[in-house]
Amino acid sequence: EVEKTACPSGKKAREIDESLIFYKKWELEACVDAALLATQMDRVNAIPFTYEQLDVLKHKLDELYPQGYPESVIQHLGYLFLKMSPEDIRKWNVTSLETLKALLEVNKGHEMSPQVATLIDRFVKGRGQLDKDTLDTLTAFYPGYLCSLSPEELSSVPPSSIWAVRPQDLDTCDPRQLDVLYPKARLAFQNMNGSEYFVKIQSFLGGAPTEDLKALSQQNVSMDLATFMKLRTDAVLPLTVAEVQKLLGPHVEGLKAEERHRPVRDWILRQRQDDLDTLGLGLQGGIPNGYLVLDLSMQEALS
């Protein structure tokens, strides 16, 4: 806190300019009018104030706007945004995408800070859903943003927003998140033709059910092994050898290198060894010939 002292004669600030960097903290407190500061916030960013001086300027704004800053001020906070606490930001009502972009720019190149996370949360809640423009903006600044959301939060993403999602945006998503995103992607891309559809849906397939994988196997999609390895194990297990062969196309040879890893390992255990042998890859661990396979889970469901 800076002590309240009278502004020395001739030092009253008439505008926010570089002369203020020569003011001591108490002089800034005494000589800079908070209302003037609020209307000329955009100038602050072009002046090399010390961190201590910025603290004084923030304090002045806090006194002027105890209930939270108006958006006209927020949009021009620039570097001063990094001085804000999550508690400060929770008082704000940010509705403009331009304001959001301006503040994300300040934090560009850094990890998502608690301030930024709070800002995004306030913005999205204010909009009611993650619309395409917002998602475009957020994933441009933070490619991992989508995967930082809970399945519940992801449920508010409209299918139309899925068009903004790039493959790298899903890199850190877990199966529960993809379970929510996949049906939205399927809906968003439903009017595309086979090969184009597969290119778009591929990143989301970690949430695909068995019946959709069976359908894809009929379309000569040539799924790569990296995508196959990210599929849900429970979705892969019911696939036949012929279906997996059609699904992977020329990439089927990659199964050998992955035979000890899920979901390939678990899938092999469910196939007849005879059927696996037809692939000519030397895959071992299938059900020996002559054995009867009882699906106990089906039996339990019936009883």
């Epitope: 570089e18 955009d42 960013n45 072009a46 002046i47 090399p48 104030f49 010390t50 620039g78 570097y79 301006a102 720019e105 300040v106 560009k108």
Partner: nanobody
Framework: LQLVESGGGLVQPGGSLRLSCAAS????????IGWFRQAPGKEREGVSY????????NYADSVKGRFTISRDNAKNTVYLQMNSLKPEDTGVYSC????????????WGQGTSVTVS
């Protein structure tokens, strides 16, 4: 991305020093630069300022007529020429850059020590 100051040292009263503030990893063209100093146990104070274009300069009253700030954008460096040094000019001098292309970036150097004795 950082600012690196150099040129400090020990000098007798009345002597001169030329401090440099060089940008590493980014270009200074769009940035306004300020020189600051901090004496032991005292508040950091602004010494000099130069606009991004170099067309505008400003100085603290205590150094006017003795210090001159300049910039060489080709060398990505800002200079502070200090003449007629006094014991009260002693302190750690650091430079700060503000503005940038998006007008929202800010960098600080670690400082260089100046002793007038």
């Amino acid at each position: 991305l950082q600012l690196v100051e150099s040129g400090g040292g020990l000098v007798q009263p009345g002597g001169s020093l030329r401090l440099s503030c060089a940008a590493s990893g980014f270009t200074l063209d769009y940035y306004a630069i300020g020189w600051f100093r901090q004496a032991p146990g005292k508040e950091r104070e602004g010494v000099s300022y130069i606009s991004s274009s170099g067309g505008s300069t400003n100085y603290a009253d205590s150094v006017k007529g003795r210090f001159t700030i300049s910039r060489d954008n080709a060398k990505n460096t800002v200079y502070l020429q200090m003449n007629s040094l006094k014991p009260e000019d002693t302190g750690v001098y650091s430079c700060a850059a503000a503005g940038g292309y998006s007008n929202s970036s800010r960098y600080w150097g670690q400082g260089t020590s100046v002793t007038v004795s």
